[in-house]
Interface confidence: low
């Protein structure tokens, strides 16, 4: 089942992890003297692993929803343990024996592996916003083909549920050009329905461009155009946006 930890608690936990990692990185890069000879490469490897781990954490930390709690706790625990071990060795580090550094390095590699198991809430190249993932097409299709394209990736041609979402999508589309959304009156003229069958809420009427929808020449499908919405011929090829819920991690 999905972890129920409130976002604020989860956020604090993740910030704590990041803080620990930052301190650990600082210890390694500033307080530990640069070693000579054979230890140098191992120290560089440890530093590199820490940097990569930090980058990975930073790339995931803005999304506080649905992270795998047990993995997160494990990472936090390992960081604490690793920090304690590093601090205890700091006076004699780098030691003549590479084994201690090797152990630290292996722990870091293990932690990075754990971190990679934290699920990405959105697939690569999708954009996360308000608990949803958005795919902005790089090519163009007619409206029906855009609907199909989204279904094929287990998503829907975008349905707008909030003003924040509308603002974000309109701005993104404006930079690119006319872009299909999942709204049409194909079933019944002048009855605007989203692809999930729901009707267009009156509170979104304000987003039509001036004089739209005008249905000039069988314009039954809706696009983001300029600063608002426009009804357009469904057979025209345009960019499109798919939307699906962000995937929460499951326990176990």
């Amino acid at each position: 089942q999905v972890s129920k930890t409130p976002n604020t608690e989860r956020q604090k936990e993740q910030e704590k992890i990041l803080q620990e990692l930052t301190q650990l990185t600082d210890e390694l890069t500033s307080r530990i003297p640069i070693s000579q000879g054979k230890n140098e490469s191992m120290q560089a490897k440890i530093t590199e692993q820490l940097m990569q781990l930090k980058t990975e954490l930073l790339s995931r930390i803005p999304i506080f929803q649905g992270q795998n709690e047990s993995i997160q706790e494990k990472i936090s625990e390992q960081l604490m343990q690793l920090k304690a071990e590093l601090l205890s060795k700091i006076s004699s580090f780098p030691v003549k024996d590479d084994s201690k550094q090797e152990k630290i390095y292996q722990q870091l590699v293990q932690m990075k592996t754990e971190l990679f198991r934290l699920c990405r809430l959105c697939p690569w190249d999708w954009t996360f916003l308000l608990g949803n993932c958005y795919f902005f097409s790089k090519s163009q299709r007619n409206w029906n083909d855009a609907v199909t394209a989204c279904k094929e990736v287990k998503a829907q041609l975008v349905i707008i549920n909030s003003d924040e979402e509308q603002t974000f999508l309109q701005q993104t589309s404006k930079a690119k050009g006319p872009t299909w959304m999942g709204l049409s009156d194909l079933k019944k003229e002048a009855t605007w329905l989203w692809v999930d069958g729901s009707t267009l809420s009156s509170r979104f009427q304000k987003y039509w461009n001036r004089g739209e929808p005008n249905n000039i020449g069988e314009e039954d499908c809706v696009e983001f155009a300029g600063d608002g919405w426009n009804d357009s011929k469904c057979e025209l090829k345009k960019f499109w946006i798919c939307k699906k819920s962000a995937t929460p991690c499951t326990e176990g």
């Epitope: 690119k176 090829k237 798919c242």
Partner: antibody
């Protein structure tokens, strides 16, 4: 997650050749674009085309002129078919997922 | 070593979404490695010394605290509206 190209060879001008890109650790089906990019010896990168794995739609630059064709042959493989090869097609051919994850490349010599 | 370098990438036409531009690092005998995507987003595992900026037609890659290992050829790649141009194009490399 990895990509691996295969099928590179030494061929004569006018010949045809098919390169295969095999994915491991993920399916090429879904919301990915699979790209082919080539690099002539000592030269820069050149985009050959892409396939939208969701439905197999393809796009090519104008210079391809129908000589190259990209297709998805299974849930883990994408191919690049090349015809009427000339010496100018001599290059290392890379496949890439969303131009983010790249294979090591395969050498084609004409 | 230790310095900063700036590489510019200029596109003859506007990039899709004004930011569909990536930066790559390539070393001899290796495939390109993604450094930056969407103009300024750091790819996973890439040090924060690499920074991308720009929008529309003008983009910049800045590498600070240069290391010997940064010696490589750097390419930019832009995504375009496929209906009016080739979908993608690479810069000539630096």
């Amino acid at each position: 997650e990895q990509l691996m190209e295969s099928g590179g060879d030494l061929v004569k001008p006018g010949a045809s050749l098919t390169l295969t890109c095999t994915a491991s650790g993920f399916d090429v089906s879904g919301s990915y674009y699979s790209h082919w990019v080539r690099q002539a010896p000592g030269k820069g990168l050149e985009w050959i085309g892409m396939i939208y794995n969701g439905d197999g739609s393809t796009w090519y630059p104008s210079w391809v002129n129908g000589r190259f064709s990209i297709s998805k042959t299974s849930s883990t493989t994408v191919t690049l078919q090349m015809t009427s090869l000339t010496a100018a097609d001599t290059a290392t051919y890379f496949c890439a997922r969303d131009l983010g994850l790249w294979g090591p490349g395969t050498l084609v010599t004409v | 070593v230790g310095g900063t370098v700036t590489i510019k990438c200029q596109s003859s036409q506007s990039i899709v979404y004004n930011n569909y531009l990536s930066w790559y690092q390539q070393k001899p005998g290796q495939p390109p490695k993604l450094l930056i995507y969407q103009a300024s987003t750091l790819a996973s595992g890439v040090p924060s010394r690499f920074k991308g900026s720009g929008s529309g037609t003008q983009f910049t890659l800045t590498i600070s605290d240069l290391e010997c290992d940064d010696a490589a050829t750097y390419y930019c790649a832009g995504g375009y509206d496929c209906s009016s141009a080739d979908c993608f194009a690479f810069g000539g490399g630096t």
